[in-house]
């Protein structure tokens, strides 16, 4: 599914992808939050920025994608496939697959989806902030 390895992407391309992911993450979270009475869980943590948070490896794309693919097994909200497709663009072809256990209890499924969706949305905000501040530093 990968057309170009990540290192062929320009920082401006990466920023465009992250901007799109930020927008999609907000849509996903908005829809997930329609399910009232579900609380965020402390049991799940989505990896976000890489230690150096520099393009092209600004975020832990393979791990994030693995979490979104797990959500996709549980839910077919329309934006999830698109999010996964965008994350694919930010992944090296030889990236190892992260294993995530799928919750089986109905309520725990909903908590997992809400928690990861919220963390993903926050992560995209951070990634975009990091990219834009890095771009400003590069021009000064």
């Amino acid at each position: 599914s990968h057309t170009l390895p990540v290192h062929f992407l320009q920082p401006s391309d990466i920023q465009k992808i992250v901007e799109e992911l930020q927008s999609l993450s907000k849509m996903l979270l908005k829809d997930v939050k329609e399910d009232k009475g579900v609380l965020v869980s402390q049991n799940y943590t989505l990896p976000c920025l890489t230690p150096d948070a520099q393009p092209p490896n600004i975020i832990h794309s393979p791990a994030i994608r693995a979490y979104l693919k797990t959500i996709r097994q549980l839910d077919n909200k329309s934006v999830i496939d698109e999010i996964i497709e965008h994350l694919d663009k930010l992944i090296f072809q030889d990236a190892p697959e992260t294993n995530i256990s799928v919750p089986t209890d109905t309520h725990e499924c909903k908590r997992f989806i809400l928690t990861i969706s919220q963390q993903f949305s926050e992560c995209m905000d951070l990634a975009l902030k990091s990219l834009t501040s890095g771009a400003q530093q590069a021009t000064t």
Partner: antibody, heavy 124, light 110 residues
Framework: QSQLVESGGGLVQPGGSLRLSCAAS?????????ICWVRQAPGKGLEWIVC?????????YYAPWAKGRFTISKDNSKNTVYLQMNSLRAEDTAVYFC???????????????WGQGTLVTVSS | AFQLTQSPSSLSASVGDRVTITCQAS??????LAWYQQKPGKPPKLLIY???KLASGVPSRFSGSGSGTDYTLTISSLQPEDFATYYC??????????WGFGTGTKVTVL
């Protein structure tokens, strides 16, 4: 009591158009489910036509054969989903159902809801 | 194109018989599978969702199993009211698979 009610069926000539409506009552349009149109020709099986997502984006998925002639849309203020059918042919004669499906695999069967169907007859 | 292959297309059985209907997807649908019963002039009635969960009000003689691409509906002891047509359906959604129904299995009296 949640209900889906189809309307707009009837007799139409080949090449004609028809717009079917699927009105939701007992629940309001919000995220986390899809509304789909399914048809059943006399004595035949169920055939999926198209689905629309009820949420942030009105994403749509069409059966390959339905693209071009059939168009799904929704009006949140009226709690209604529509199916616009153009260039109708005799083989489009069928009972047209609308149905609601959960977007979550974990959800209870209350998310599976079908209307009673509306008959469309294409004949000269 | 994505396909759901249901078999057999028809079967004849007697009251008390154990009946098995299979549904095979052309690619994995992650248990996004429902089974319906339909009688003439009526909309389909949900029996099983998420491959194996019994819908409310459905007798326990109906059961579903399977994962990945292969799924089964079993009626442990056929009752007079069970003579009908049965359909499998995927509601996976998304652009890569879409939605769809099996071709149906008509269960008639032997």
């Amino acid at each position: 009591q949640s209900q889906l009610v189809e309307s707009g069926g009837g007799l139409v000539q080949p090449g004609g158009s028809l717009r079917l409506s699927c009105a939701a009552s007992g629940f309001s349009f919000s995220a986390n489910y899809w509304i789909c149109w399914v048809r059943q020709a006399p004595g035949k099986g169920l055939e999926w036509i198209v689905c629309i997502y009820i949420g942030s984006r009105a994403d749509t998925y069409y059966a390959p054969w339905a693209k071009g002639r059939f168009t799904i849309s929704k009006d949140n203020s009226k709690n209604t989903v529509y199916l616009q059918m153009n260039s109708l042919r005799a083989e489009d004669t069928a009972v047209y159902f609308c149905a609601r499906f959960s977007s979550g695999i974990y959800d209870l069967d209350r998310f599976f809801l079908w209307g009673q169907g509306t008959l469309v007859t294409v004949s000269s | 194109a994505f396909q759901l292959t249901q078999s057999p297309s028809s079967l004849s059985a007697s009251v008390g018989d154990r009946v098995t209907i299979t549904c095979q997807a052309s690619q994995s649908i992650d248990s996004w599978l429902a089974w319906y019963q339909q009688k003439p002039g009526k909309p389909p009635k949900l029996l099983i969702y998420q491959a194996s969960k019994l819908a409310s009000g459905v007798p326990s003689r109906f059961s579903g199993s399977g994962s990945g691409t292969d799924y089964t509906l079993t009626i442990s002891s056929l009752q007079p009211e069970d003579f009908a047509t049965y359909y499998c359906q995927t509601y996976y959604g998304g652009g890569h698979i879409g939605w769809g129904f099996g071709t149906g299995t008509k269960v008639t009296v032997l």
